[in-house]
Structures are given as C-alpha cells and as structure tokens.
C-alpha cells in the first residue's frame, strides 16, 4: 500500500491548524517547558516493516485525537479550529487503516510492533500527566500544542518515506 498524496496534504493542514490554534505567546510560557521524551527512534522507520510503521503512525494520531477531544481541550481551544483538526486527524486515521488492511498477509512480520505502540502510549501518558500536574493551565496547553506540532513534523518524515516506499 502506498499512502495517497492527500495524506501528506492532510498532515500539512494539521500542522497549519495547530499553528493557528496558538493563543498565547510561547515566550510567556518558557518556565513551563518540558521534555516529554518523544520516542524519535520509533519514527526513524529503519527497524521495522511497512505495516508496523503504519501501526505506529496510527497510534500517534489516535492518541493525539484522544488528547484533543477531552473536555479540558474543548474549553481551551477555538471550537471551529478543533473541528477542522478532528476532520484532518480522522482522514489520516482512515488512510492508515485502509493501508493496514492492504498489508494483511503481504509480509511475514507481525502487523504491529508491540514495543513501539506501548512506547507511543507512554509518551502520551507523560503528556497527560504533565497537563494534570499543571492543572490544564493555558501555558501547559501551549507547551503541549508545541510538542504535538513537533512530533507531527518528526513523524512526517516517516510518512514521506512510506509514501515513496515500494
């Protein structure tokens, strides 16, 4: 399966929407900066098959969807932008699910890299813990928004490789 061109466009639109969502200057939140330990190794795409890479991307997008569809998130971000954001994430999840179905039976390796999925979940668990610790303050959400933008940018490299990979 080759991810469609529309998937890359959707990823770019997601980044643009997230950029528009920013309400406060990141400079006013410097004291709240935090290292969430983004699992870069899971997105290098060297150590696993295509189906496994797709499952890792799917997990990241699903967790992002979960994070931004909470009550606390709805109270923080512009509703119109959030709806656009959900639409783009939903589109990407559908693309990846369609791709995963095509990969069934194509490779001998398992469709899921369990370690990688769990690692991505722990990454989002740290983000949720941070928000709770910071009582979902505007600055905490700003730090999280910047972090998710960064993680989407980094995962875009893997998505591009998947789009080109035979």
């Amino acid at each position: 399966c080759d991810l469609p061109q529309t998937h890359s466009l959707s990823n770019r639109r997601t980044l643009m929407i997230m950029a528009q969502m920013g309400r406060i200057s990141p400079f006013s939140c410097l004291k709240d900066r935090h290292d969430f330990g983004f699992p870069q190794e899971e997105f290098d795409g060297n150590q696993f098959q295509k189906a496994q890479a797709i499952s890792v991307l799917h997990e990241m997008i699903q967790q992002t969807f979960n994070l931004f569809s909470t009550k606390d998130s709805s109270a923080t971000w512009d509703e119109t932008l959030l709806d656009k954001f959900y639409t783009e994430l939903y589109q990407q999840l559908n693309d990846l699910e369609a791709c995963m179905m095509q990969e069934v039976g194509v490779e001998d390796t398992p469709l899921m890299n369990v370690d990688s999925i769990l690692t991505v979940r722990k990454y989002f668990q740290r983000i949720t813990l941070y928000l709770t610790e910071k009582k979902y303050s505007p600055c905490a959400w700003e730090v999280v928004r910047a972090e998710i933008m960064r993680s989407f940018s980094l995962s875009a490299n893997l998505q591009e490789r998947l789009r080109r990979k035979e």
Epitope: F48, N113, V114, D115, S116, T119, K122, R126
Partner: antibody
Framework: EMQLMESGGGLVQPGGSLRLSCVAS????????MSWVRQAPGKGLEWVAS????????YYAPSVKGRFSISRDNSNNTLYVQMNSLGVEDTAFYYC???????????????WGQGTLVIVST | DIRVTQSPSSLSASVGDRVSISCQTS??????LNWYQQRPGKGPQLLIS???TLQSGVPSRFSGSGSGTDFILTIISLQPEDSASYYC?????????FGQGTKVEIK
C-alpha cells in the same frame, strides 16, 4: 528463583570489540524490557541501553550511541550487548538489568545481575 | 537529558539515627523516581519505585516521598546492615539518569 547471569567480560584493547551476554531465569523473560547499566570501578551508575520486551524498541545513552548495539533472543532468554570502538572510558562493571515493564521509561530497574568486568587497556 | 542531583555525597550516622537523602531532578518526573541500595562488592538492589512504593522484602524502616522535582529517601532507624551507597534514578524518560550516589557509613 529469579536470576540474571552476565558473561563475556574481559580485557580488550582500545578500538576493540566485545560482546556481553546475559542469561535470565526464574521469570517470563519475553514480558519485560531489559537494560544494561555500567559502573566504573569506585564510581556511580550509568545507564547504557534498553530494549523492549519484543526487541522492537531500542534506546541508548548518548555516550555509547553508534558504538553499542543491544539485542535479545527471547527463545533462549538471553540479552546481548555488542560493544565496538571501545575506549578506556568504557572500562566498568556491566550489569544486566530487568525492568518492571514491557518497554523502557516510566518504570524501575527491579532486578540486577552480579555484573561482568570489562577492562579497556593497552 | 534530565539531570539528577543527590545530596549529601556521604554521611556518617549512629545506629538508631534517622537519616535522610535528598534527590532533585532538573525537570518534573512526576513520581517516576526510584531508589537503589548498593552494598560493597554487590550489584544494586531496588528499594523504592515510583517515589514511595517499597519493594517486597525491603524493611519498613525505609521510606520514600516526593513528586515533581524533589524527593527524599528516609531511613527511620539506621541499622548496621544499611551501610551502603544509595542512588536515586529518574525512570521518566530515556536516557535514564542516576544521582551521583550517597555513601552511608555507621559511626
């Protein structure tokens, strides 16, 4: 009884290579992440590398990245570390360690081997 | 990387004394801070995980507290067998980092 037994340590010249092994027993090896932690004689502890329960996720300390490679064989309950381009600063006791979870981070190192000494010297 | 700072580097106390060791991290690690004991010539042993969870078989005189960036290991009544080095370690993100250690001696 849960046990971790390291082997493969010894004297090696700078620039040389060495492969350490660790055989696990007494617990379900394939269910836990594993790590290597080292300790230079008379010094503190330094985490070296971790591998997820299925061998899929691998993490390295900046000081060893690109030189060391961690791997595991779940069918033989064995953890490995391949160490290349060794320098004198790699001289240490190397401990094989079981983690409390299936993947690295947000857990603890709850079981340690007795350690194997690696000496890098001319 | 998260820096872990432990203090004091060494201490000497009498049997029965209350002893505290402090550990600070350069950013919040929530509760993901672990404590280890290493007796001379032995491998380390996990005493406390997740800031305050005592491992099975560890005497109840050991306790851990704290969250975020500040943590404390307390030995309520020091015993001769507690003569050892103690290390804290953040398990929040890789690379895992350890404190430099505290050597506890019995007077």
């Amino acid at each position: 009884e849960m046990q971790l037994m390291e082997s493969g340590g010894g004297l090696v010249q700078p620039g040389g290579s060495l492969r350490l092994s660790c055989v696990a027993s007494g617990f379900t090896f394939k269910s836990f992440a594993m790590s290597w932690v080292r300790q230079a004689p008379g010094k503190g502890l330094e985490w070296v590398a971790s591998v997820g329960s299925q061998g899929g996720s691998k993490y390295y300390a900046p000081s060893v990245k690109g030189r060391f490679s961690i791997s595991r064989d779940n069918s033989n309950n064995t953890l490995y570390v391949q160490m290349n381009s060794l320098g004198v600063e790699d001289t240490a006791f190397y401990y094989c360690v079981k983690e409390t979870d299936a993947v690295a981070t947000m857990d603890a190192l709850d079981m340690w081997g007795q350690g194997t000494l690696v000496i890098v010297s001319t | 990387d998260i820096r872990v700072t432990q203090s004091p580097s060494s201490l000497s106390a009498s049997v029965g004394d209350r002893v505290s060791i402090s550990c600070q991290t350069s950013q919040s690690v929530n509760i993901y801070l672990n404590w280890y004991q290493q007796r001379p010539g032995k491998g380390p042993q996990l005493l406390i995980s997740a800031a305050s969870t005592l491992q099975s078989g560890v005497p109840s005189r050991f306790s851990g507290s704290g969250s975020g960036t500040d943590f404390i290991l307390t030995i309520i009544s020091l015993q001769p067998e507690d003569s050892a080095s103690y290390y804290c370690q953040q398990g929040y993100i890789t690379p895992y980092t350890f404190g430099q250690g505290t050597k506890v001696e019995i007077k």
